[in-house]
């Protein structure tokens, strides 16, 4: 009988996986090392897939190897001593200056260098750098970047305001429509702030005498209606208004006279005025009733070569005349004339000239007041220093307003360095159909009077006092203000500006940076301003946009008996 050979020789088991081989009768048994399985221990056990020990007990990565396995960690984690658990590396604690001047924030497996809003981390310099949001086209119109943020601005002077998203711009809308109808038959005398509105030259037979007839309407108390002179400037006649009454000044080779008389006619009604040169006098009539007769020894204007040549100027006179007047007068006159007849020549030729020029046309209906059309400003130089006042400078302001648009600068003080140390503006409120009044120092709002119904038929009255220590609102309204400490800081800025030169602007701002104030739109509507007890007369301004009407205010388009006509009773002027 042949002996059965040793079944373990040659070795039938997988050399890597077996622990021992046991010879049997014509068979063998391989005993496997841990991590191996199969008849010949040829198969690796994948401990990472063992359902009874999920992921091999590893908290993160299980790596299977022939006959074994080991756990490993993802980047940013470290293995604990049990060789199974991975712990997050706290890089911020490990290297405290990892982020430089930024704040280090540990996150699982990593870290972040955090910067305040409006800043971005610079890996090279290990610091937070300002994000220039303006380069990312965040704003619809103008963008001003500053450390940590940005502000969008809209060109108020072009009629835009910042929308609620604080990025886009929207048109400042009309909140109270006005009747801006004009008629070419009505000549507007205040078309130019400085200068003559119309100039006519007459060459008539020598038997002619000076005469002027016209209907006249104004609320203005002073100004030149018309000025006539001889061709050689040797004789002249001035028809003006002073204190609401007709004034005549005349000068020729025989005489020099000034006369004022008649009733007050700056009542906003049409008054028929006639000035007629008679043989021995000049007759002035109002509503066909003689109010003045001025004696004259000879003809007003001397004919030459059989012709009477006369130059007539409406609403002004040549510059050189100013020094020759018997009594100086501010020539600016906000008024209208119609149905004129000069030198008994009717209106021939003049109507045709006026018809073509829209800005020479007068409004059909007007009310008393000053009108800012939202296209320009008036400038005043006011001395706010009061020697007798221990507080130094002070500003007492009374505004009577009837806005037509809900956003615009009503009053502003501007420094020589183009900052706006004080402004009172109107802004459309977040609540529908109402406005806020904001008082600002430079670009900081210090007072906000919220949600007032200002766009109404009735005028609103606002009164406040400012000095270096305080801002006091005298109209009983609910205000939102900054902290007392911040208010004092802002008043100190105003105080510093008031010690220098400031110009006062009504109706808007001159060319200052958009970022100089919270509001930069022109005011649109009617407004009367009293500063330190003086009613500001726009005819007395240093400069004024031609479109601003000093003494006439358009009527409201149509009166409706609805809630929009209701004004806060606290704002109604008790006078």
């Amino acid at each position: 009988v042949n002996a059965i050979p040793d079944q373990c020789s040659p070795l039938p088991c997988n050399e890597d996986g077996y622990m021992s081989c046991k010879d049997g009768k014509a068979s063998f048994t391989c005993t496997c090392k841990p991590g191996w399985q199969g008849e010949k221990c040829e198969f690796d056990i994948n401990e990472c897939k063992d359902p009874s020990n999920i992921n091999g007990g590893c908290s993160q990565i299980c790596d299977n190897t022939p006959g074994s396995y080991h756990c490993s960690c993802k980047s940013g984690f470290v293995m604990l001593s049990n060789k199974k658990d991975c712990k997050d590396v706290d890089e911020c604690s490990l290297k405290p200056n990892m982020c430089g001047t930024a704040v280090c924030k540990n996150i699982p497996g990593d870290f972040e260098c955090e910067c305040p809003e409006g800043y971005r981390y610079n890996l090279k310099s290990k610091s937070c750098e300002d994000v220039d949001e303006c380069s990312e086209n965040m704003c619809a119109q103008l963008c001003v970047n500053y450390p940590g943020g940005y502000t969008c601005y809209c060109d108020g002077k072009k009629g835009f305001k910042l929308a609620q998203d604080q990025k886009s711009c929207e048109a400042v809308s009309v909140c109270l429509p006005l009747n801006l109808d004009t008629k070419y038959e009505l000549l507007y005398l205040a078309e130019q702030f400085a200068g003559v509105v119309l100039y006519l030259k007459f060459r008539l037979p020598e038997i002619s005498r000076f005469s002027a007839e016209f209907d006249f309407r104004t609320y203005d108390s002073q100004g030149v209606i018309l000025y006539a002179e001889s061709i050689d400037h040797s004789a002249w006649l001035l028809i003006a208004l002073r204190g609401g009454k007709i004034e005549v000044q005349l000068k020729n080779e025989h005489t020099s006279k000034i006369t004022t008389g008649g009733d007050i006619i700056n009542n906003g009604l049409w008054n028929m005025v006639s000035v007629e040169e008679l043989e021995h006098s000049i007759s002035i009539k109002i509503a066909k009733e003689a109010v003045m007769d001025i004696n004259k020894p000879g003809p007003l204007f001397k004919p030459e070569n059989g012709l009477l040549e006369t130059k007539v100027y409406f609403a002004g006179f040549p510059r050189k005349v100013e020094s020759e007047l018997i009594k100086p007068i501010n020539p600016r006159l906000d008024g209208c004339i119609r149905s004129w007849n000069l030198m008994k020549q009717g209106a021939s030729g003049i109507k045709e000239i006026i018809q073509e020029k829209q800005n020479k046309h007068c409004l059909v209906t007007v009310e008393k007041g000053s009108y800012y059309p939202g296209s320009g400003i008036a400038e005043f130089h006011i001395d706010y220093n009061n020697g007798s006042n221990a507080e130094g400078w002070h500003i007492n302001v009374t505004l009577n307003i009837r806005p037509s648009m809900g956003t615009g600068v009503m009053l502003a003080l501007v420094s020589s360095n183009n900052t706006v140390p004080f402004a009172v503006s109107l802004v459309d409120s977040t609540s529908e159909k109402s406005q806020d009044i904001v008082i600002s120092v430079e670009n900081t709002v210090i007072y906000r009077i919220q949600a007032l119904s200002l766009c109404s038929n009735q005028r609103s009255h606002l009164e406040f006092r400012v000095n270096r220590n305080n801002l006091e609102l005298l109209t009983p309204l609910k205000i939102e203000t900054i902290s007392q400490e911040e208010l004092q800081t802002q008043l100190a800025i105003l105080d510093k500006a008031m010690k220098g030169k400031v110009a006062t602007y009504l109706g808007g701002l001159p060319d200052v940076p958009f970022s100089a104030t919270p509001v930069n739109a022109f005011y649109n509507g009617c407004m009367e301003v009293n500063i330190n007890g003086v009613e500001l007369d726009l005819d007395e301004a240093i400069s004024k946009h031609n479109d601003i009407r000093a003494h006439s205010c358009p009527s409201v388009w149509k009166k409706t008996k609805n809630s929009e006509d209701q004004v806060d009773p606290r704002l109604i002027d008790g006078k």
């Epitope: 001593s81 712990k87 604690s93 490990l94």
Partner: antibody, heavy 119, light 106 residues
């Protein structure tokens, strides 16, 4: 398997000195941060000192209560960490544990050695 | 300096009862670690990085929290869970432990 074995505890008089040792095995000692933590009934668990790895310049840190009196050191060739304690006070009494520290937590602890400071 | 306050100092629970212990910090921290210590033994790392259980720790344990308030919760008390639990944090080169919560079985 990580093994930490403290030795050197005993009774010492106030003002005296004592040096504790910790023998480590089962891990790459030179890469490890090692700490001493003590425990007393009065103060509970209290961290004492830390010595970091060669990669971290063997930097040492101490609790305010032991600064200037205790010194932590290590010998990477012997896989050992030491705590030299001088000017001992009764409040230093407690069980002193040697710990393997991983990413700011005490990963493995020895069985502890007791120090008694008393006259 | 950061201080950790554990509450309650001692508590007891019946088998199967839910247990919650808290660790309050006087200043915000990123992570909290928890240790278990049984009488006569050294402390053992139990929960790390606020909510991760060390391998071998029963799943009835859980950790949570952020900023200045952290907690360890045991969903169902068992006899072997009776021990003292310590919270620990690291900040500004200093390690701090809480005073411990001793959990006893009723």
């Amino acid at each position: 398997e990580v093994k930490l074995e403290e030795s050197g505890g005993g009774l010492v008089q106030p003002g005296g000195s004592m040096k504790l040792s910790c023998a480590a095995s089962g891990f790459t000692f030179s890469d490890a941060w090692m700490d001493w933590v003590r425990q007393s009934p009065e103060k509970g668990l209290e961290w004492v000192a830390e010595v970091r790895s060669k990669a971290d310049n063997h930097a040492t840190y101490y609790a305010e209560s032991v600064k200037g009196r205790f010194t932590i050191s290590r010998d990477d060739s012997k896989s050992a960490v030491y705590l030299q304690m001088n000017s001992l006070r009764p409040e230093d009494t407690g069980i002193y544990y040697c710990t393997l520290t991983t990413a700011f937590l005490f990963d493995s602890w020895g069985q502890g050695t007791t120090l008694t400071v008393s006259s | 300096q950061i201080a950790l306050t554990q509450s309650p100092a001692i508590m007891s629970a019946s088998p199967g009862e839910k247990v919650t212990m808290t660790c309050s910090v006087n200043s915000s921290v990123s992570y909290m670690h928890w240790y278990q210590q049984k009488p006569g033994s050294s402390p053992r790392l139990w929960i790390y990085d606020t909510s991760n259980l060390v391998s071998g720790v029963p799943g009835r344990f859980s950790g949570s929290g952020s900023g200045t308030s952290y907690s360890l919760t045991l969903s169902s008390m068992e006899a072997e869970d009776a021990a003292t639990y310590y919270c620990q944090q690291y900040s500004g080169y200093l390690y701090t432990f809480g005073g411990g919560t001793k959990l006893e079985i009723k």
